[in-house]
């Protein structure tokens, strides 16, 4: 009887990666393309329909468009190999390969997709009133993760974690965790994104810096005061110039010089 086999019935792949799932079928001598039929489906979605030596892309489900292909060269090695690129979380499920070549048979293959919380972005800010530090870690992944905060001496600290849906893909989770703590410069803290499953932890290291930039609320005060101080400086400079030289030309030179130097200071202030 015509029988197809699978070397693996479970494939685990990372979000955004590529996967090639294989079903093997018997080929004696050379493959007769016109006698071969290959179907790949996932639940009710048609992915590949290969008949008379060609794929019919008209029947392919739109979610697999430009991402799924049958590796035709592999057919001559007795393999119906489905390659999926840029794997999405929605691709997870049970796939079925059906091959007709004289006889017919089918096999099921499970695809699991995971997304590690690998790119952890971090931020450290300080409250100017209480001098308390706020440490923040944020990352996207799947499935849900809890965030564990620890200090360099391995103390577990209690942070606050919020989970929302990602803007990138609906099934992806956006996990943000904050830790408020009194800390000193060069002290080290760790945020660990812990998912269910073995070896699924991702950790970021946060080092308290020597000096921290002024929080946004403080910068607002400077933005309000800035123009006033600038104006005051210009008035004082003009008065000084007029008193010292008593000539309009000197006033213009002095003001220009002062205004330019002020501009440079503003730029430097904005950059820091």
């Amino acid at each position: 009887a015509f029988t197809i086999t699978v070397s693996k019935d479970l494939y685990v792949v990372e979000y955004g990666g590529n996967v090639t799932m294989e079903c093997k079928f018997p080929v004696e001598k050379q493959l007769n393309l016109f006698a071969l039929i290959v179907y790949w489906e996932m639940e009710d979605k048609k992915i590949i329909q290969f008949v008379n030596g060609k794929e019919d892309l008209k029947v392919q489900h739109s979610s697999y468009s430009q991402r799924a292909q049958l590796l035709k060269d592999q057919l001559f090695l007795g393999k119906a190999a489905l390659q999926i690129t840029d794997v999405r979380l929605q691709d997870a499920g049970v796939y079925c390969c059906l091959i007709g070549y004289g006889g017919a048979d089918y096999k099921r293959i499970t695809l699991k997709v995971h997304a590690p919380y690998r790119n952890i972005s971090q931020r450290i800010s300080v409250d100017p009133v209480t001098s308390e530090h706020e440490l923040m870690c944020q990352a996207e992944g799947y499935p849900e993760a809890e965030v564990i905060w620890t200090s360099s001496d391995h103390r577990v600290l209690s942070g606050k974690t919020t989970i929302t849906n990602s803007n990138r893909e609906e099934k992806l989770f956006n996990v943000t965790s904050t830790l408020n703590i009194n800390a000193t410069a060069n002290e080290i803290f760790y945020c660990t994104f812990q998912r269910s499953g073995p070896e699924e932890n991702n950790t970021a290291e946060l080092v308290i810096p020597e000096r921290l930039p002024v929080p946004a609320s403080e910068r607002t005060h400077f933005m309000i005061l800035g123009p006033f101080l600038l104006l005051l400086g210009v008035v004082l400079a003009v008065t000084f110039c007029l008193k010292k030289h008593g000539r309009m030309m000197d006033v213009e030179k002095c003001c220009t010089r002062d205004r330019n130097s002020k501009k440079r200071n503003d730029i430097q202030f904005e950059e820091t």
Epitope: L31, L33, F34, V51, N52, G53, K54, E55, D56, L57, K58, L71, K72, D73, Q74, L75, F76, L77
Partner: antibody, heavy 117, light 112 residues
Framework: QVQLQQSGPELVKPGASVKISCKAS????????MNWVKQRPGQGLEWIGW????????YYNERFMGKATLTVDKSSNTAYMLFSSLTSEDSAVYFC??????????WGQGTTLTVSS | DIVMTQAAFSNPVTLGTSASISCRSS???????????LSWFLQKPGQSPQLLIY???NLASGVPDRFSSSGSGTDFTLRISRVEAEDVGIYYC?????????FGGGTKLEIK
Amino acid sequence: QVQLQQSGPELVKPGASVKISCKASGYTFTDYYMNWVKQRPGQGLEWIGWIFPGSGATYYNERFMGKATLTVDKSSNTAYMLFSSLTSEDSAVYFCLRSDWDVGDFWGQGTTLTVSS
Amino acid sequence: DIVMTQAAFSNPVTLGTSASISCRSSRSLLHTNGITYLSWFLQKPGQSPQLLIYQMSNLASGVPDRFSSSGSGTDFTLRISRVEAEDVGIYYCAQTLGLPRTFGGGTKLEIK
């Protein structure tokens, strides 16, 4: 740009073997099929077979099975065709031709094989 | 194997006028996916063949739009709207539906 550079002309004795090469450049060698085509003097084109460098998979026209053997060297982006048990009928120009699954688009300049005692 | 048939010679044409070259296949090259797997190649004297048309009606890169192709599943025609001196050579049709790939015998374009 895509280029297929074939080896020079060959003059060989009947019963001998010959290996013709086709060096590819300007594209990813392992992503396309390399076809071989025979053209006898003053005659049409005859497809010998192809090899897919990525996997080494081959397909031969039944008429050339046992006569032609297709191989590749991925490290040098070169495809080879070994022709064995040569007779005067094998005297021809042999072309390599790059293709995807459906379309052959770039040809080598051809290698002239003369079988004569 | 799919057999491709062509006339050895075309009707002689005058430069600047149109020319037609025919090709027939022993089985339909129209696939259920709606694509017809026929290619046209031109081999100029002393040169390698070059691709003109693929999938029956698609013009290959760099080929002037004077060339066009049409047909049913088994009968095909290559048209050259304004023949130029550089168009002389042998025109081959080829099927890429089945394996082995097969070529027609070639049609020589003759100029009056």
